[in-house]
């Protein structure tokens, strides 16, 4: 018969024949001959391949390097990579999260506008007029000044995006 | 990971350079390229995360463009419009928006007429 | 654009001695930076992660600090083998990743 110049799924063709893939999770040791079958070995521990394959070596299960702000969302098998995620406090990179950082915080005169989440950073505004920030938060959002009326008291020292309005007491009309 | 050889371009050409990958699934990790001109600095051009987003640096998005395929294991730079300005070694690293712990050895372009 | 400024350079110490290097971001970039030793004719060697994490196997002659945009690598107890090129690299994000401009370290 005319050697195949195609093979079936999960099958490649070698030396003018036909083998059989290895299926996911496991490696090709030696190509199939006339007489023997393709022989795969089980990737070892730590090791995955996730598709049916002639591969030589598995490959590494990701490292969720928590230098990286990463850590271990779904533990890795022989036929899938672990999955990582970011640390509480620290969001993706990208898309893919190959690597996190720590969440922004808002410097003193900006508040929060969002709070941050594993995959989007701290979305700081501006204090608007009346409003005030004088921390660094990836939390606090900008506060109203003090009510001096309500309290019966009179601005003693106006409040900017960054500081209270400062309080007193009411001069007292003499008689 | 290794960069496939460059070489002497002229001004005007295409240049297409190639990253084979062994070790670890394109899947799993991104790739990024960074070139150098001679006795400068480093110049991050763009990279491809592990779930195929392409991403450029500024000044490259209008001439480069960076592709995967993941059965081959290979990761393929394109930029156009070559000028001696592009003269450079060029490396492909391990990683998308990261940190780049893998490099190749880096290979030399040159553009010249 | 985004930038990272990298000063100073060159920058020389004895050997046994102590050189700092600096890397300033142009905006926020959290804890996003990286450091890394470029030798002639190499590819360049990653030594901190996360602004001041050590790399795995680098030593811990190398101290890396800061966050937001102000950054410092300190190298103590020079030896002639750390004399190389130096890069700050940011990866806050996709329209922040870059390097910075480089500074070499001449050890005498």
């Known amino acids: 018969p005319e050697p195949p110049t195609a093979c079936r799924e999960k099958q490649y063709l070698i030396n003018s024949q036909c083998c059989s893939l290895c299926q996911p999770g496991q490696k090709l040791v030696s190509d199939c001959t006339e007489f023997t079958e393709t022989e795969c070995l089980p990737c070892g521990e730590s090791e995955f391949l996730d598709t049916w394959n002639r591969e030589t070596h598995c490959h590494q299960h990701k490292y969720c390097d928590p230098n990286l702000g990463l850590r271990v969302q779904q533990k890795g098998t022989s036929e899938t990579d672990t999955i990582c995620t970011c640390e509480e406090g620290w969001h993706c990179t990208s898309e893919a999260c190959e690597s996190c950082v720590l969440h922004r915080s808002c410097s003193p005169g900006f508040g929060v506008k969002q709070i941050a989440t594993g995959v989007s950073d701290t979305i700081c505004e501006p204090c608007p007029v009346g409003f005030f920030s004088n921390v660094s938060s990836a939390f606090e959002k900008c506060h109203p000044w003090t009510s001096c009326e309500t309290k019966d008291l009179v601005v003693q020292q106006a409040g900017t995006n960054k500081t209270d309005v400062v309080c007193g007491p009411q001069d007292r009309l003499r008689a | 990971v290794k960069e496939s050889e460059g070489g002497l371009f002229k001004p005007t050409d295409t240049l297409t350079l190639t990253c084979t990958v062994s070790?670890?699934?394109?899947?799993?990790?991104?790739v990024s390229w960074v070139r150098q001109a001679p006795g400068n600095g480093l110049e991050w051009i763009g990279g491809i995360g592990s779930d195929g987003s392409a991403y450029y640096a500024s000044w490259a998005k209008s001439r480069a463009t960076i592709t995967r395929d993941t059965n081959l294991k290979t990761v393929t730079l394109e930029m156009t419009s070559l000028t001696a300005a592009d003269t450079a070694t060029y490396f492909c690293?391990?990683?998308?928006?990261?940190?780049?712990?893998?490099w190749g050895p880096g290979t030399l372009v040159t553009v010249s007429s | 654009a985004f930038e990272l400024t990298q000063t100073p350079s060159p920058v020389s110490a004895a050997v046994g001695g102590t050189v700092t290097i600096k890397c300033q971001a142009s905006q926020s970039i959290s804890n996003g930076l990286a450091w890394y030793q470029q030798k002639p004719g190499q590819p360049p060697k990653v030594l901190i992660v996360g602004a001041s994490n050590l790399a795995s196997g680098v030593s811990s002659r190398f101290k890396g600090s800061g966050s937001g945009t102000e950054f410092t690598l300190s190298i103590s107890d020079l030896e002639c083998a750390d004399g190389a090129t130096y890069y700050c690299q940011s990866y806050f994000s996709s329209s922040s990743t870059v390097f910075g401009g480089g500074t070499e370290v001449v050890v005498k």
């Open positions: 070790g670890f699934s394109l899947s799993s990790y991104g």
């Open positions: 690293a391990r990683g998308g928006i990261t940190v780049y712990a893998i």
